[in-house]
Interface confidence: low
C-alpha cells in the first residue's frame, strides 16, 4: 500500500462503519470527503492492500459554482454475498497533490452458522488399518464444536466431547460412512458424508516355491479383508531389463506386465511360458468385492538355466588318413542359458566311444589311433550349459577327404588310449 499521511487537513469527514453478519449478507460501506478543487478518485483498502476489483461507486457534488470551491464526494463499496474473504479492515485512500490520505478504518466481520474449511473426504483404506479423517469448521461466533458420526451414529455424547479436527479410526472391517457436525451459538451445520471403502490389506511374504527354466511357482500370504472374502489375486510379472530400475516401491512397471489371476485359496500360482535364465520382477494384489489391495513391492526373481533344446547344427566330419576334421554351428534351438561349451563323442564299429569336452570352439581336428583303418567312424556333438547337456546330434559318419577340399589347420587333439569320459546313457 502507498505511504499515507494522517495530516490535520485530512479530507475525510465520514469513515466506513462496521458490518457484521452471516454469510450471504449484502452490505454497503461509505466514505465521505470534503475537498477543495478537483475531486480525487477514491480507492478502497482492505487490510492495507488496494482492492483492484472493488464494486464501488463514487458520487461527487460541488458545493459552489467555481471549480476551486469545495466538493463533497461519497464513495460506496458494496459487499454482495458476504464471504470469509471479505472480512477485514477497510479504509479509503485518496491521492491529493503530493500527499496520500487514508480514512479511519471500518471492519467487516462474519457471524453465523459454522462454515466448513475442511470436510471428511471419500477414501479407501486397508482392512484393520488405522487412519485419520479431518474436519475443520469456523464461526464466528466461536467456539465451534465438532461431533463426528459413523454410519449416522454419534461417536461422542455431545459436541466438543469427542475428537475434534482429526478423527483417529483404529481400523475398519467393513465399508462405512463418516460425517461431522459443527455446532456454535448460531446452530448446527453438517458436513458431507464420506464413504470409507475397506479394501484387502496388501498381501505379505510373496516368495518363490519352485523354479523351472520356463516357469515359476510363487506363493504369498493374504492380508485381512474385513467382512469381505477375497475373490481372487492378481499376479504381475515383468522382465527385468538391467537399465529398467524397478525400485522396491515403484508404482508402475516400465513395460506391459504379464498378468495372471489366481483363484483363492490356495494363495499360490504357477507362472508359465517364461524365458529361461531370465530375471523378472513380480508383485501381487488381492481383490474383494470392495476392490483390490495395494500391490506388494516388486520382488526380483529369476528363472534357472535349462539345457539347450537342440543339438549343434550343420555338423561336418571329414577324414584324411589318421586325422579327422569336425566342425559345427551353435544350436538354432534356444540355449536356455549361457553356453559353456560342446561335448563330442566318436566311435568306430568295433571300438569304444571316445568322449571329449571341446569348450567353446566349434571345430576340432582329431588324431586317430593307428593308421586310421577304423571302419564306420561316427561323430556326435552336444552343447551344454550349467544345467547340463542338450540333446546329442544324430551320428555323423566321417567322410573321406577329397583333393581340392579345403582342409584348414586346426589344433590337433590326440585321441586318448582310453575314453576320456564315460557316458552311460550314450
Amino acid at each position: 500500500a502507498p505511504r499515507g499521511t494522517q495530516a490535520e487537513e485530512s479530507p475525510f469527514v465520514g469513515n466506513p462503519g462496521n458490518i457484521t453478519g452471516a454469510r450471504g449478507l449484502t452490505g454497503t460501506l461509505r466514505c465521505q470527503l470534503q475537498v477543495q478543487g478537483e475531486p480525487p478518485e477514491v480507492h478502497w483498502l482492505r487490510d492495507g492492500q488496494i482492492l483492484e476489483l472493488a464494486d464501488s461507486t463514487q458520487t461527487q457534488v460541488p458545493l459552489g459554482e467555481d471549480e476551486q470551491d469545495d466538493w463533497i464526494v461519497v464513495s460506496q463499496l458494496r459487499i454482495t454475498s458476504l464471504q470469509l474473504s471479505d472480512t477485514g479492515q477497510y479504509q479509503c485512500l485518496v491521492f491529493l497533490g503530493h500527499q496520500t490520505f487514508v480514512s479511519q478504518p471500518g471492519y467487516v466481520g462474519l457471524e453465523g452458522l459454522p462454515y466448513f474449511l475442511e470436510e471428511p473426504e471419500d477414501r479407501t483404506v486397508a482392512a484393520n488399518t488405522p487412519f485419520n479423517l479431518s474436519c475443520q469448521a469456523q464461526g464466528p461466533p466461536e467456539p465451534v464444536d465438532l461431533l463426528w458420526l459413523q454410519d449416522a451414529v454419534p461417536l461422542a455424547t455431545a459436541p466438543g466431547h469427542g475428537p475434534q479436527r482429526s478423527l483417529h479410526v483404529p481400523g475398519l472391517n467393513k465399508t462405512s460412512s463418516f460425517s461431522c457436525e459443527a455446532h456454535n451459538a448460531k446452530g448446527v451445520t453438517t458436513s458431507r458424508t464420506a464413504t470409507i471403502t475397506v479394501l484387502p490389506q496388501q498381501p505379505r511374504n510373496l516368495h518363490l516355491v519352485s523354479r523351472q527354466p520356463t516357469e515359476l511357482e510363487v506363493a504369498w500370504t493374504p492380508g485381512l479383508s474385513g467382512i469381505y472374502p477375497l475373490t481372487h489375486c492378481t499376479l504381475q510379472a515383468v522382465l527385468s531389463d538391467d537399465g529398467m530400475g524397478i525400485q522396491a516401491g515403484e508404482p508402475d512397471p516400465p513395460e506391459e506386465p504379464l498378468t495372471s489371476q489366481a483363484s483363492v485359496p490356495p494363495h499360490q500360482l504357477r507362472l508359465g511360458s517364461l524365458h529361461p535364465h531370465t530375471p523378472y520382477h513380480i508383485r501381487v494384489a488381492c481383490t474383494s468385492s470392495q476392490g483390490p489391495s495395494s500391490w506388494t513391492h516388486w520382488l526380483p526373481v529369476e528363472t534357472p538355466e535349462g539345457v539347450p533344446l537342440g543339438p549343434p547344427e550343420n555338423i561336418s566330419a571329414t577324414r584324411n588318413g589318421s586325422q579327422a576334421f569336425v566342425h559345427w554351428q551353435e544350436p538354432r534351438a534356444p540355449l536356455q542359458g549361457t553356453l559353456l561349451g560342446y561335448r563330442l563323442a566318436y566311435q568306430g564299429q568295433d571300438t569304444p566311444e571316445v568322449l571329449m569336452d571341446i569348450g567353446l570352439r566349434q571345430e576340432v581336428t582329431l588324431e586317430l589311433q593307428g593308421d586310421g583303418s577304423v571302419s564306420n567312424l561316427t561323430v556326435c556333438v552336444a552343447a551344454y550349459t550349467a544345467a547340463g547337456d542338450g540333446p546329442w546330434s544324430l551320428p555323423v559318419p566321417l567322410e573321406a577327404w577329397r583333393p581340392g577340399q579345403a582342409q584348414p589347420v586346426h589344433q590337433l587333439v590326440k585321441e586318448p588310449s582310453t575314453p576320456a569320459f564315460s557316458w552311460p546313457w550314450w
Partner: antibody, heavy 120, light 107 residues
C-alpha cells in the same frame, strides 16, 4: 503446525564464514518470504535481509551487504544465511522468521535461533 | 529508511495495570507497524500488525493503535505472563527497522 527449525550453535574465528539453515514445515515454503534477523547479546533486533523462495529474490540491509548471502532450497524447504568475514561484533543470536501473508514484512513465525559466537 | 523510536526503554508495573508503549516513525508508513513480545531465551512472538490487527491466538488484552507516525501498544490488564521485552517494527518497506525495545518489569 508451522515450524521453523534452525541449525545448531556455531563458534567461529574472526574472518571465517558461517552458514546456518532454517528448515520449515507446516506451510507452503514458497508462499511468502523468509526474513533473517539478528540479536547481539543483551541488545535489540536487527533485520539482515529476506528471500522470496518462490523466485529466489532477495533484499538485504545495506549495512551488511557484501558479507551476507541468503539462499533457499525449495526441494527441502530450507533457507540459508551465509555470513563471511566474521567479526567479534557479529556474535549474536540469528533468527529466521516467516513473512506474514498479509504483510510479508511482518513476521508471524520464528525459528528458535542459532547462536553464532565469533572469538579468536 | 524509516526509523522507529520506541519509548520508554523500560517500565515497572504491577499485575492488573494498564501498560502503554509508544513507537514513533520517522515518516508515515500507512500504519504498517507490528509489535512483538520477547521473553528471555526465546524468539520474538508477533502480537500486532497493521498497527491494530491482533495476530492469531493473541489475547484481547493486547491492542494496537495509532496512525501516521505515532503508534501505541496497550496491555489493558497486565498478567504475570506479560513481563517481557516488547519491540515495534515498521513493515511498510525494506530495510525493515525495529524500535530499541521496552522492557516491562515487575514493580
Amino acid at each position: 503446525e508451522v515450524q521453523l527449525v534452525q541449525s545448531g550453535a556455531e563458534v567461529k574465528k574472526p574472518g571465517a564464514t558461517v552458514k546456518i539453515s532454517c528448515k520449515v514445515s507446516g506451510y507452503s515454503f514458497t508462499g511468502h518470504t523468509m526474513n533473517w534477523i539478528r540479536q547481539p547479546p543483551g541488545k535489540g533486533l536487527e533485520w539482515i535481509g529476506l528471500i522470496k523462495p518462490s523466485n529466489g529474490g532477495t533484499s538485504y540491509n545495506q549495512k551488511f551487504k557484501g558479507r551476507v548471502t541468503i539462499s533457499a532450497d525449495k526441494s527441502i524447504s530450507t533457507a540459508y544465511l551465509q555470513w563471511s568475514s566474521l567479526k567479534a561484533s557479529d556474535t549474536a543470536m540469528y533468527y529466521c522468521a516467516h513473512g506474514h501473508y498479509e504483510s510479508y514484512f511482518a513476521m508471524d513465525y520464528w525459528g528458535q535461533g542459532t547462536l553464532v559466537t565469533v572469538s579468536s | 529508511d524509516i526509523q522507529m523510536t520506541q519509548s520508554p526503554s523500560s517500565l515497572s508495573a504491577s499485575v492488573g495495570d494498564r501498560v502503554t508503549i509508544t513507537c514513533k516513525a520517522s515518516q508515515d508508513n500507512s500504519s504498517a507497524v507490528a509489535w512483538y513480545q520477547q521473553k528471555p531465551g526465546q524468539a520474538p512472538r508477533l502480537l500486532i500488525y497493521w498497527a491494530s490487527t491482533r495476530h492469531t491466538g493473541v489475547p484481547s488484552r493486547f491492542s494496537g493503535s495509532g496512525s501516521g507516525t505515532e503508534f501505541t501498544l496497550t496491555i489493558s490488564s497486565l498478567q504475570p505472563d506479560d513481563f517481557a521485552t516488547y519491540y515495534c517494527q515498521e513493515h511498510f518497506s525494506t530495510p525493515l527497522t525495529f524500535g530499541q525495545g521496552t522492557k516491562v518489569e515487575i514493580k
